[in-house]
């Protein structure tokens, strides 16, 4: 089936926005005014995954770029990366597992759990201007809660 997608931005629970930091990395920092235009717009695609009544599988691509967030092992540690794909073949309903995140809504906040690495989440640091990463703890120092803002196509 044709994949259903929507455009959105994400902010962590401390209201930090996500921006590009070099060609293959995202960082989180507070933005205001015109600087808000720097934040990345995601194309969130609703894909096949181990869907449950409270987890919705999605893929997170960067709008109008052939880049997707993916989860891989680097030095034996689950790691978040931006991966380049062939735009002719993506997005698709049946994404490879490394591209899939379980979107979990709790108390109007969103978590994004890696399908490839259960209990690992898209995370940001408390500190400003630090990379977005895959974290293996919830409820600690690092932030795993986000809000989503819809962006018109």
């Amino acid at each position: 089936a044709p994949v259903r997608s929507l455009n959105c931005t994400l902010r962590d629970s401390q209201q930090k926005s996500l921006v590009m930091s070099g060609p293959y990395e995202l960082k989180a920092l507070h933005l205001q005014g015109q600087d808000m235009e720097q934040q990345v717009v995601f194309s969130m695609s609703f894909v096949q995954g181990e869907e449950s009544n409270d987890k919705i599988p999605v893929a997170l691509g960067l709008k109008e770029k052939n880049l997707y967030l993916s989860c891989v092992l680097k030095d034996d540690k689950p790691t978040l990366q931006l991966e380049s794909v062939d735009p002719k073949n993506y997005p698709k309903k049946k994404m490879e597992k490394r591209f899939v995140f379980n979107k979990i809504e709790i108390n109007n906040k969103l978590e994004f759990e890696s399908a490839q690495f259960p209990n690992w989440y898209i995370s940001t640091s408390q500190a400003e201007n630090m990379p977005v990463f895959l974290g293996g703890t919830k409820g600690g120092q690092d932030i795993t809660d986000f809000t989503m803002q819809f962006v018109s196509s």
Partner: antibody
Framework: EVQLQESGPGLVKPSETLSLTCTVS????????VSWIRQPPGKGLEWLGL???????YYNSPLKSRLTISKDNSKSQVSLKLSSVTAADTAVYYC????????????????WGQGTLVTVSS | DTQVTQSPSSLSASVGDRVTITCITS??????MNWYQQKPGKPPKLLIS???TLRPGVPSRFSSSGSGTDFTFTISSLQPEDFATYYC?????????FGQGTKLEIK
């Protein structure tokens, strides 16, 4: 060889809880999802829900409030509990293995148990 | 939820006949349609999985075609052991949904 076998009481009283067990062999429950399906006598197939390898569950909306699916990977068993049953829950209940092939066929079901008839009657 | 409409609900045919069953879905499911055969007192048996893929050991007289919303299941030359009930199942999205079934009887 992949096998699934349903077991449980054949008779349940109205308003009680129907409990069934699916014992599997030939594959690991931590790697593959298992669905439950039922078929009332002389009627078609209804998909009830599933439990994934990681333990997450998806329940079909009409039964969501009454249905619980759980599993014990070490015993290779998946269980179904359906509460507050009525005569309309009389059916043959099947468990089936999900193909769980990421990026290809995640939701299809390939192997089924023989089924067990559950009658709801006082 | 994706609704699946299967037709006909019953069908009388003779050995050697060519038989066709159709399933129409309420949403585009790409090629994610599966076809099962069920005999009385037995569980459904998967004949054709998504992508119109014949399962190992299933005779080549069984075939399917279609994508999107319109799907066809064909038995090219009916054999005595083919008289059974056939179901389609969409596996594109949850909840999984079956067609209502087609009972194939001897004419």
């Amino acid at each position: 060889e992949v096998q699934l076998q349903e077991s449980g009481p054949g008779l349940v009283k109205p308003s009680e809880t129907l409990s069934l067990t699916c014992t599997v062999s030939g594959f690991s429950l931590s790697d593959y999802g298992v669905s439950w399906i039922r078929q009332p006598p002389g009627k078609g197939l209804e998909w009830l829900g599933l439990i994934w390898g990681g333990g997450d569950t998806y329940y079909n909306s009409p039964l969501k409030s009454r249905l619980t699916i759980s599993k014990d990977n070490s015993k290779s068993q998946v269980s179904l509990k359906l509460s507050s049953v009525t005569a309309a829950d009389t059916a043959v209940y099947y468990c089936a293995k999900q193909r769980t092939l990421w990026g290809y066929d995640l939701y299809g079901m390939d192997y089924w148990g023989q089924g067990t008839l559950v009658t709801v009657s006082s | 939820d994706t609704q699946v409409t299967q037709s006909p609900s019953s069908l009388s045919a003779s050995v050697g006949d060519r038989v066709t069953i159709t399933c129409i879905t309420s949403t585009d499911i790409d090629v994610d349609m599966n076809w099962y055969q069920q005999k009385p007192g037995k569980p459904p048996k998967l004949l054709i999985s998504q992508g119109n893929t014949l399962r190992p050991g299933v005779p080549s007289r069984f075939s399917s075609s279609g994508s999107g919303t319109d799907f066809t299941f064909t038995i090219s030359s009916l054999q005595p052991e083919d008289f059974a009930t056939y179901y389609c199942l969409q596996s594109d999205n949850l909840p999984l949904t079956f067609g209502q079934g087609t009972k194939l009887e001897i004419k």
